[in-house]
């Protein structure tokens, strides 16, 4: 069984690597354009040059291609706290990241937001903050972890999961309440 290929892959696979099949004449293989350039005109015939032009400012191609247009450079999202790590060039897209002591939280595959790394106040650092992961904290006695912050057990309601971690404190509070009602 022959695996099913898309039309474009089918056309490209007829030619050797680094070349593509002429869209109007499938007996001609044209040389692909280098990264940083795009296809302006297909090669007129076998052994003749493809007309490739350099990407204009604000656009790029990161690999050899036969694209009719360069790709638009990405913009870093200020509203998500992103900063530019390196600017766009004709052969490389903008690289966006976060400031020092921040990490990336991915809301989806292509959208991240920058947040400050947790300092683990009232606790200790179990795992240091990394590019794509917040600090992992371990809380001191009398504190429990809520949204990666160490919160006092006095803020622990009986219905929450903190009850196990704060069990002695909760019983003390309960005992005080009981003695107050007799």
């Amino acid at each position: 069984l022959v695996p099913h290929l898309g039309d474009r892959e089918k056309r490209d696979s007829v030619c050797p690597q680094g070349k593509y099949i002429h869209p109007q004449n499938n007996s001609i293989c044209c040389t692909k354009c280098h990264k940083g350039t795009y296809l302006y005109n297909d090669c007129p015939g076998p052994g003749q040059d493809t007309d490739c032009r350099e990407c204009e400012s604000g656009s790029f191609t990161a690999s050899e291609n036969h694209l009719r247009h360069c790709l638009s450079c990405s913009k870093c999202r200020k509203e998500m706290g992103q900063v530019e790590i390196s600017s766009c060039t004709v052969d490389r897209d903008t690289v966006c990241g976060c400031r020092k002591n921040q990490y990336r939280h991915y809301w989806s595959e292509n959208l991240f937001q920058c947040f400050n790394c947790s300092l683990c106040l009232n606790g200790t650092v179990h795992l240091s903050c990394q590019e794509k992961q917040n600090t992992v904290c371990t809380c001191h006695a009398g504190f429990f972890l809520r949204e990666n912050e160490c919160v006092s057990c006095s803020n622990c309601k009986k219905s929450l999961e903190c009850t196990k971690l704060c069990l002695p404190q909760i019983e003390n509070v309960k005992g005080t309440e009981d003695s107050g009602t007799t």
Epitope: K78, E79, F115, N116, E147
Partner: nanobody
Amino acid sequence: EVQLLESGGGMVQPGGSLRLSCAASGFTFEHEGMVWVRQAPGKGLEWVSHIGEDGQSTYYADSVKGRFTISRDNSKNTLYLQMNSLRAEDTAVYYCANIPKAGPSFDYWGQGTLVTVSS
């Protein structure tokens, strides 16, 4: 007290349109980036679209790009989501929320509005 009240959901046929609204109160709306998220039946939350406080910077998930438009009216403290060319896979409860600032969880969001796309 922060309140976010979504409206405009309903049942619509594939290819149809709806406009969702989110009325905000209890905070300085114009100083907040706002987001629409959705939850399809039996699935997790999906970040659909957001808009910066200035109203200029916008983002759309690939699944809605070219079909949905986010906008805001700071004078009315209201966020909008215009949904065109609706598909069955857009069926979900839609929520509006502030873009989080301190950490990756939503401090406030509304009760949601159900969008059902079915023939």
